[in-house]
Structures are given as structure tokens and as C-alpha cells.
């Protein structure tokens, strides 16, 4: 799903006060829920009929330095007999979410959002057929 | 996927620096990326064998303001002939994403993250058999 | 205009490997399956498998697991089959052939094709 | 793996006459498609989702069937519709095609 754009309203103080110094503002450190779990069923990614792998990006600039990006293991989808139906596609199910880059020269720390498009998972769907002449 | 614990590690200065002052640090206003494009429009929601529905929720102290929840629509999986097969399960695809937190006193502005549990759509499985003895 | 522009022929030595090379252009490469179609002198056209970049959705047909591999260059909109272990039998024209791109199109629903590769296998 | 049987394997045909080749297929099939080829050149799409012309197809080709047994044809033949035909299903994997039907104008 799409992040809609900012435009920067959402950072910026009411009109009635003065504006935000050197365009940044203050990130409180800590985060909300950080503790908060997935209750994501076990090994979805095998017992998919679309099945998946992961790959890990790793990065140390960025929080999460993690991101975890799936790929569909095949085109077609996978029928109860265990073979590929290829009348069907696994696509997959994408999200913007948010991450944060930290900049650095010497001692001057500062950090900035950005957006990153992952694949979470894969899904099986019967192709729409709109043939175009 | 789950965002591995900050640690806070990650928004510290390096050790020889200064610490930050008052428990934050500087976001610069701006999203990198922020004209990166999801290619989701294609209604797969609808057209998946593990359909599911959105729900959108709205804060305008969270950045992005908009939040969009996945739900599956059935506990089986749809199959070709549209019928609901209840050998296999819809399951949800989860994902720990972080938003942004406005906190305001007056003309004090300050901002958090916040860790955020979605449900991005849903992917038909075969159940995991338990036999007890 | 859809283009799939191929690489040249090539002449191999029994046991060695190839790798020939699909160029793209006039399409968003990611959004489109590649498949790869074998024809042995000019008779039955034999599907080797398909590659799709957006999903890394891979499909092989069984005879050639293990004899060819398929990836995608993104940046370079390039789709490339590598194939090893190459005998006589691999002498062939490789056609890449562009596939749907699984939501509006089934994956498998082949439209444009590239010229073509010719492989020989000689000692 | 379903199998695509085309008949005949080589016809021939005059400027005018109607032409009908047919694609058997070994197991149940949605669709059939067909892709058409001249000698020293790459396959194009002709027919596909059984019935539907391809863009630039001339209006004389027409295609029909279902299950297992499928046919291409052609009302009036003309010099430029020489070439081979292959029928191709994927509906089961591996996605096959027929060892095609060689139209020659006599």
C-alpha cells in the first residue's frame, strides 16, 4: 500500500509559531511499541500455494539496518497435488514503509525518513484477463 | 517481518563525540524516495484465492496520517469454481512497519517513531496437521 | 514499440556453457515475464522456462532443470539464459518471448519474441 | 504433460481456398493459442485465448474448439499466409506447443 505524500505540513509547527530552525526538527529518542510482536502464522512462506524466500538487506546507515525483502519462488501456484498450476500467478503483495537514514560528518549527527518498497509476502491470484489490441 | 530492537545504539553519537542533548536528536524534513511508486492498483485484494478486505485507519498526529489494515475475507481459500475450500486456510501476511508521532505543547513540536503491526493481505496455506497420539 | 533484442551466435565446445542475452525495450521490463523457447532445426518449439522480475517467480519446464538457469539484469532491462554441460543435442535457435505480467495478463500469455540466438555445439 | 498433436503436418492450398488445421490435445484445455512462423524468422503471435486475433492478423483467420480439439482457419488464402502454424496450450505445466502444421501456396 502507498504512503501518501508529505508535503511536509505534518513536520511543521502551527502557522501562529516560528518556524522550524535549519529545516530539521526534534526526534525523540525511544520508540513506541517497540516491543510489540508478529503473530504471524509459522512458515507461511513454504506452506504457501504461492510460496516464497527471503533475502536480508543489510544496512548500518539505516533503522532497521534490516529489511527483509520475500521473492515468489515460482509463476504459477502451487495445487494440492504439489505442482505448479500455471493457470494461476503468484504475484506479489508489496508496502512503503518507513525507515531512517542516519547522516554523518564527525561529530554532526542527523537523520532523515525514508520511504522503502518491500515485498512482504506473495499471494495467489487468477490473472484478469484485458487483452489489449 | 519483524524490526529488531533499536537498542537506541543506532541514534547515539559515536562514543569520542558529545551525547545529545535532552534525550533527542535532529530529523531533517524531507522523505528520500518519497516519489517512489507501489505498481498495487490491479485489485489483487479481490482477485486472490485468500481474498481480503481494507480497512484504512486515520490519526493526523502520525505521519503517514493514513493507515491501511488487511483482512482476510474467509478462513478457507477460494477455488476456481469460486467456491470456499475449507481444506486450505487464508492467512494474514504481516509486517512491522514504523510511522512517525506528532507530540505538541503549544508551539513545542517533538516526534517519535512508533513501531506499527500491519496486515498487508493474505496468502492461502495448507494447514499445518497436528496429530496427537 | 515492444523490442527484445538478442545477442549473436555462438559456436561451443562440447561440456562448455553459454550464455546468451535478452535487451529490452519499449515496455517497464519489470512488470513482464521472460520465458525462453528452444528450436532445434526449424522444427517443434520446446518452453524452457520462464523468469518473471517483479515477483522473482522462476518456472522450468522439467527437461531442462539443470541444464539452463534464467536471470534478469533490472538495470539494464537484460534478461539472460544461461545454459552448461552443452552437448550436440543442445544445437538450437533460443528465442526469448515476452509473458504476461500476472495481474491483468497470465504469466504465461506469450506475445512479442526476440530474433533469435543460434547455439552450436561442435568440437 | 499435456501433449499437442497438429494435423496435417504439411498442406497445401490455392490463392482463394479455405483453409482448416486442427490441434489435438491429450488433456482438457481452457484455451489454445497460436503462433505463426516463416522460414528464417521468429514466431508471432497469431490467435490466442482460443478465438481472439492478434494485433495486424487479417480478418480471413479465425480460430475455435474447445477441450480437447481446437482448429485454425483460413477463409480465402493468400501468397503471405504460407508459413507454419503452431497451436501452444498453458493451461497445465509445462506450458507445450504441437510440432505445427507447414502451410505451402501451391
Known amino acids: 500500500r502507498k504512503i501518501p505524500k508529505v508535503g511536509h505540513t505534518f513536520f511543521q509547527k502551527p502557522e501562529s509559531c516560528p518556524p522550524v530552525p535549519g529545516g530539521s526538527m526534534k526526534l525523540d529518542i525511544g520508540i513506541i511499541n517497540e516491543n510489540q510482536r508478529v503473530s504471524m502464522s509459522r512458515n507461511i512462506e513454504s506452506r504457501s500455494t504461492s510460496p516464497w524466500n527471503y533475502t536480508v538487506t543489510w544496512d548500518p546507515n539505516r533503522y532497521p539496518s534490516e529489511v527483509v525483502q520475500a521473492q515468489c519462488r515460482n509463476l504459477g501456484c502451487i495445487n494440492a497435488q504439489g505442482a505448479e498450476d500455471i493457470s494461476m500467478n503468484s504475484v506479489p503483495i508489496q508496502q512503503e514503509t518507513l525507515v531512517v537514514r542516519r547522516k554523518h560528518q564527525g561529530c554532526s549527527v542527523s537523520f532523515q525518513l525514508e520511504k522503502v518498497l518491500v515485498t512482504v509476502g506473495c499471494t495467489c491470484v487468477t490473472p484478469v484477463i484485458h487483452h489489449v489490441q | 517481518r519483524k524490526i529488531p530492537k533499536v537498542g537506541h545504539t543506532f541514534f547515539q553519537k559515536p562514543e569520542s563525540c558529545p551525547p545529545v542533548p535532552g534525550g533527542s536528536m535532529k530529523l531533517d524534513i524531507g522523505i528520500i524516495n518519497e516519489n517512489q511508486r507501489v505498481s498495487m492498483s490491479r485489485n489483487i485484494e479481490s482477485r486472490s484465492t485468500s481474498p481480503w478486505n481494507y480497512t484504512v485507519t486515520w490519526d493526523p498526529n502520525r505521519y503517514p496520517s493514513e493507515v491501511v489494515q488487511a483482512q482476510c475475507r474467509n478462513l478457507g481459500c477460494i477455488n476456481a469454481q469460486g467456491a470456499e475450500d475449507i481444506s486450505m486456510n487464508s492467512v494474514p501476511i504481516q509486517q512491522e512497519t514504523l510511522v512517525v508521532r506528532r507530540k505538541h505543547q503549544g508551539c513545542s513540536v517533538s516526534f517519535q517513531l512508533e513501531k506499527v503491526l500491519v496486515t498487508v493481505g493474505c496468502t492461502c496455506v495448507t494447514p499445518v496437521i497436528h496429530h496427537v497420539q | 514499440e515492444v523490442q527484445l533484442q538478442q545477442s549473436g551466435p555462438e559456436l561451443v565446445k562440447p561440456g562448455a556453457s553459454v550464455k546468451i542475452s535478452c535487451k529490452t525495450s519499449?515496455?517497464?521490463?519489470?512488470?513482464?515475464?521472460m520465458h525462453w523457447v528452444k528450436q532445434s532445426h526449424g522444427k517443434r518449439l520446446e518452453w524452457i522456462g520462464g523468469?518473471?522480475?517483479?515477483?522473482?517467480?522462476?518456472s522450468y519446464n522439467q527437461n531442462f532443470k539443470g541444464k539452463a538457469t534464467l536471470t534478469v539484469d533490472k538495470s539494464s532491462s537484460t534478461a539472460s539464459m544461461e545454459l552448461r554441460s552443452l552437448t550436440s543435442e543442445d544445437s538450437a535457435v533460443f528465442y526469448c518471448?515476452?509473458?504476461?505480467?500476472?495481474?491483468?495478463?497470465?504469466?504465461?500469455?506469450?506475445?512479442?519474441w526476440g530474433q533469435g540466438t543460434s547455439v552450436t555445439v561442435s568440437s | 504433460q499435456i501433449v499437442l498433436t497438429q494435423s496435417p503436418a504439411i498442406m497445401s492450398a490455392s490463392p482463394g481456398e479455405k483453409v482448416t488445421m486442427s490441434c489435438s490435445a491429450s488433456?482438457?484445455?481452457?484455451?489454445m493459442h497460436w503462433f505463426q512462423q516463416k522460414s528464417g524468422t521468429s514466431p508471432k503471435r497469431w490467435i490466442y485465448d482460443t478465438s481472439k486475433l492478434a494485433s495486424g492478423v487479417p480478418a480471413r483467420f479465425s480460430g475455435s474448439g474447445s477441450g480437447t480439439s481446437y482448429s485454425l482457419t483460413i477463409t480465402d488464402m493468400e501468397a503471405e499466409d504460407a508459413a507454419t502454424y503452431y497451436c501452444q496450450q498453458w493451461n497445465s505445466h509445462p506450458l507445450t506447443f504441437g510440432a505445427g502444421t507447414k502451410l505451402e501456396l501451391i
Open positions: 523468469i518473471n522480475p517483479n515477483s522473482g517467480g522462476v
Open positions: 518471448a515476452r509473458g504476461g505480467d500476472g495481474y491483468y495478463t497470465n504469466y504465461f500469455d506469450i506475445d512479442y
Open positions: 519499449g515496455y517497464t521490463f519489470n512488470e513482464y515475464t
Open positions: 488433456s482438457s484445455v481452457n484455451y
